[in-house]
Interface confidence: low
């Protein structure tokens, strides 16, 4: 067989035996002559150096460039490749010689004691046990121990080749301490030398750099980078670093193994790169590569070297932050700087301190933003070394999803008289103002007490068929007025009104306001009745302990069986304007009340008296009347609010004052309470009597003393009294100057 590329001028050396494979018996002589065109050399098995005594290489007698190799009494171990080659070239001719020695079918290694096989537990890797054969077609199996296992060639991944040895997937013998090959010849077993199995790991789990990122230094500072490789057991690691300035004099590399806990399935290796005084040329990418031979993993980090300490805001620093009420707001202070700056936040010039609602650090975090958080926030960065300062203003705008004011009122569920014109209102507060307020409607009977739908607190109306008010077929004729804007409680609000031109059909109306951050809605129950009417005598809103009558008036010719009820507690809390109607359909929630009936010329009037009304009497009162002909029930509902009794209080103080003779004094004393208190004035603990100079106005709230005289000086007391007690405030009025003499004197 020929090996190597033929050169232009040289032919391959020519062997006397023109075969690729030669098989000879043991104890015979092997002789091969090689001829060529230049100086030749021989290589043979087991001793590639040519110092073997048994082997004789002689010059041929009959020509130049000719050498004969002779081995007398060959043995099995002489099996192998015999190569004749031109010196200092790749041109060679090879013959493989099998020396058939049935007593020693395996070629012994040089050491002859035992071999070592290195394997990895990789499913895809195979290992070759080098038990070469002196006979080409042996039946060879591999024995592994302990426990004893035998592997036979399977024509696939397990095979034996006389020139190569026994090939087997490495994981199959990774458990074994040793392996050997065995050949059977005429029922006789022959064994190769033992091979010790050494399992070598290769897996690198990860390579971690510390610090991993954001490494910043200024010129002259020390850089220390740690590179940790975590591997499986039985692994050796080589570290290799790449960095910008390779010619650094002050660079130091230390590699060491780290101790791991006993029983750990892992090894750790550490390589530390130290540069004592960095320069600008040390800025750049630092890469640490860990290699186990079969595997390499690397990690990189960027090291930034600054000329000197500095601070500046990053380009991503926001100037406007928009948020919705209730959200968590994060405003990061984006900066460039070394070393990291001290950060201080201010709102409208006042320093912000961290508490449970706000965290003022690298990131300004407002846990649950509210309207009052709107404003200008200033962040000041201070470099801790140079003390250089930079400031930036961030405007925070807090948006409010639409809130409908009427929802917070206890909405009346009063009925509306058939044919009347009614106005429904939604007052919307939103930031930004709502871009639209839409009205929808739904027939009452399509919505109230729908059995198939569970009424919940969040969806008290199980309505499924809301229609736009433009489509009022089957409903009341509607006109939506142009939105109005009003300043209410110091807030700009949008007021949308819906005019029902004639209340013909009982319905539910819904206003829905939408702005860029959300929506709000209010459902209004609009129950239309042709039936009875409710009035309150004497007052719409009695105070507790006062008496009140509820009058239910119905046409005698149309209605009969007038009855008063009070709406009982609901199975679920009912929210604003969320009373499913008509109540007539659900008498289970009504409590029957005692009442007195009287008649006039056309009407029956049922009167329900509440003597000494209490807060418990508040609620929804229902008058039920039955149509004489159809027996259909008609209900009217009226909400009764009883005002709580409140002892008098005086808001604001009377101020001591000094006034010159002849001037005027005007003071005011505002009192509140329920029932409303009576106000009285005293001077020096005596009741103040009105005269030409002393004027009391607005229920004694305002006291005016005209053209004050010296005798008006004294202690003035304002006292507000009701059945629940009195409240008072006092002030001393000093009158300066000399009293002018009058003609009378």
């Amino acid at each position: 067989a020929s090996v190597g590329l033929p050169s232009v001028s040289l032919d391959l050396p020519r062997l006397s035996i023109q075969k690729d494979i030669l098989t000879i018996k043991a104890n015979t002589t092997l002789q091969i002559t090689c001829r060529g065109q230049r100086d030749l050399d021989w290589l043979w098995p087991n001793n590639q150096s040519g110092s073997e005594q048994r082997v004789e290489v002689t010059e041929c007698s009959d020509g130049l460039f000719c050498k004969t190799l002779t081995i007398p009494k060959v043995i099995g171990n002489d099996t192998g490749a015999y190569k004749c080659f031109y010196r200092e070239t790749d041109l060679a001719s090879v013959i493989y010689v099998y020396v058939q020695d049935y007593r020693s079918p395996f070629i012994a290694s040089v050491s002859d004691q035992h071999g070592v096989v290195y394997i990895t537990e990789n499913k895809n890797k195979t290992v070759v046990i080098p038990c070469l054969g002196s006979i080409s077609n042996l039946n060879v199996s591999l024995c592994a121990r302990y426990p004893e296992k035998r592997f036979v060639p399977d024509g696939n991944r397990i095979s034996w080749d006389s020139k190569k040895g026994f090939t087997i997937p490495s994981y199959m013998i990774s458990y074994a301490g040793m392996v050997f090959c065995e050949a059977k010849i005429n029922d006789e077993s022959y064994q190769s030398i033992m091979y010790i199995v050494v399992v070598v790991g290769y897996r690198i789990y990860d390579v971690v750099l510390s610090p991993s990122h954001g490494i910043e230094l200024s010129v002259g500072e020390k850089l220390v980078l740690n590179c940790t490789a975590r591997t499986e057991l039985n692994v050796g690691i080589d570290f290799n670093w790449e960095y910008p300035s390779s010619k650094h004099q002050h660079k130091k590399l230390v590699n060491r193994d780290l101790k791991t806990q006993s029983g750990s399935e892992m090894k750790k290796f550490l390589s530390t790169l130290t540069i004592d005084g960095v320069t600008r040329s040390d800025q750049g990418l630092y890469t640490c590569a860990a290699s186990s031979g079969l595997m390499t993993k690397k990690n990189s980090t960027f090291v930034r070297v600054h000329e000197k300490p500095f601070v500046a805001f990053g380009s991503g620093m926001e100037s406007l932050v928009e948020a919705t009420v209730g959200e968590r707001v994060r405003i990061p202070a984006k900066y460039l700087g070394y070393p990291p700056p001290e950060i201080k936040w201010y709102k409208n010039g006042i320093p912000l301190e961290s508490n449970h609602t706000i965290k003022a650090g690298h990131v300004l975090t407002i846990m649950e933003v509210s309207e009052r958080d709107t404003g200008n926030y200033t962040v000041i960065l201070t470099n801790p070394i140079s003390k250089e300062k930079q400031s930036h203003v961030v405007s925070l705008v807090v948006y409010v999803p639409p809130q409908i004011g009427e929802k917070s009122l206890i909405s009346p569920v009063d009925s509306y008289q058939y044919g009347t014109t009614q106005t429904l209102t939604c007052t919307v507060y939103a930031i930004p103002p709502p871009h639209h307020i839409h009205w929808y409607w739904q027939l009452e009977e399509e919505c109230a007490n729908e059995p198939s739908q569970a009424v919940s607190v969040t969806n008290p109306y199980p309505c499924e068929e809301w229609r736009s008010v433009e489509d009022f077929q089957g409903g009341n004729k509607i006109e939506v007025n142009k939105n109005q804007f009003a300043l209410i409680e110091g807030k700009n609000k949008t007021v949308s009104t819906l005019v029902i031109q004639a209340a013909n059909v009982s319905a539910l109306y819904k206003c829905e306001a939408v702005n860029k951050v959300g929506r709000g809605e209010r459902v209004i129950s609009f129950h239309v009745t042709r039936g009875p009417e409710i009035t309150l005598q004497p007052d719409m809103q009695p105070t507790e302990q006062e008496s009140v009558s509820l009058w239910c008036t119905a046409d005698r010719s149309t209605f009969e069986n007038l009855t008063w009820y009070k709406l009982g507690p609901q199975p679920l809390p009912i929210h604003v304007g969320e009373l499913p109607t008509p109540v007539c359909k659900n008498l289970d929630t009504l409590w029957k009340l005692n009442a007195t009936m009287f008649s006039n010329s056309t009407n029956d009037i049922l009167i329900m008296e509440l003597k000494n009304a209490s807060l418990q009497d508040q609620g929804d009162y229902v008058c039920l009347a039955q149509d004489r002909k159809t027996k259909k029930r008609h209900c009217v509902v009226r909400q009764l609010t009883v005002l709580e009794r409140v002892a008098p209080t005086i808001t604001g103080n009377l101020e001591n004052q000094t006034t010159s003779i002849g001037e005027s004094i005007e003071v005011s004393c505002t009192a509140s309470g329920n029932p409303p208190p009576q106000i009285m004035w005293f001077k020096d603990n005596e009741t103040l009597v009105e005269d030409s100079g002393i004027v009391l106005k607005d229920g004694n709230r305002n006291l005016t003393i005209r053209r004050v005289r010296k005798e008006d000086e004294g202690l003035y007391t304002c006292q507000a009294c009701s059945v629940l007690g009195c409240a008072k405030v006092e002030a001393f009025f000093i009158i300066e100057g000399a009293q002018e003499k009058t003609n009378l004197e």
């Epitope: 399509e446 729908e450 199980p462 068929e465 089957g474 259909k632």
Partner: antibody, heavy 113, light 111 residues
Framework: EVQLVESGGGLVKPGGSLRLSCAAS????????MNWVRQAPGKGLEWVSS????????YYADSLKGRFTISRDNAKNSLYLQMNSLRAEDTAVYYC??????WGQGTLVTVSS | QSVLTQPASVSGSPGQSITISCTGT?????????VSWYQQHPGKAPKLMIY???NRPSGVSNRFSGSKSGNTASLTISGLQAEDEADYYC???????????FGTGTKVTVL
Amino acid sequence: EVQLVESGGGLVKPGGSLRLSCAASGFTFSSYSMNWVRQAPGKGLEWVSSISSGSSYIYYADSLKGRFTISRDNAKNSLYLQMNSLRAEDTAVYYCARDFGNWGQGTLVTVSS
Amino acid sequence: QSVLTQPASVSGSPGQSITISCTGTSSDVGGYNYVSWYQQHPGKAPKLMIYDVSNRPSGVSNRFSGSKSGNTASLTISGLQAEDEADYYCSSYTSSSTPYVFGTGTKVTVL
């Protein structure tokens, strides 16, 4: 374009049953109340039954209560009318209508022995 | 189940105006502004012409108008044309046991 197509009509003996179907398309079927209206040969329109969008409210003409059942399948955009114990006077063209603003072409039911 | 009363037939010459009445009770026509009118040509499905007493759906000629007084609703067709020859039905929402009621129908003939 709103389309309503009735099917299921035909000849049936007195006392028998039929199930009419109405396939709806061109609108959000699940948002609308639906109705059946019938018209006997040479006679006027007679409202038969209504069903709300969620099937919560169902109404029938007094004369038909107990014999006819209206139902709907919003997933299939379909309205149904199950007619049992049919009588000769139930012979009519049965229309399916949405809000009475859109009507199908009708299906003829003939009850005769 | 009550029905609304309409005249059996009304006729008019082309270009003339005609009015069809629809009488109910305070429980239907009189009680609610929910009266509709339908046109039906022979062998065809009804077509909505007027809703809510006086509103016209898009696509319906402005020659058709509706009104109501007390318990009686009316449909007026002005400038009568040959294609107006058809049956006309009124309907109303009713507060009785069933929500809808139709009229007896009126045959309009264009002479």
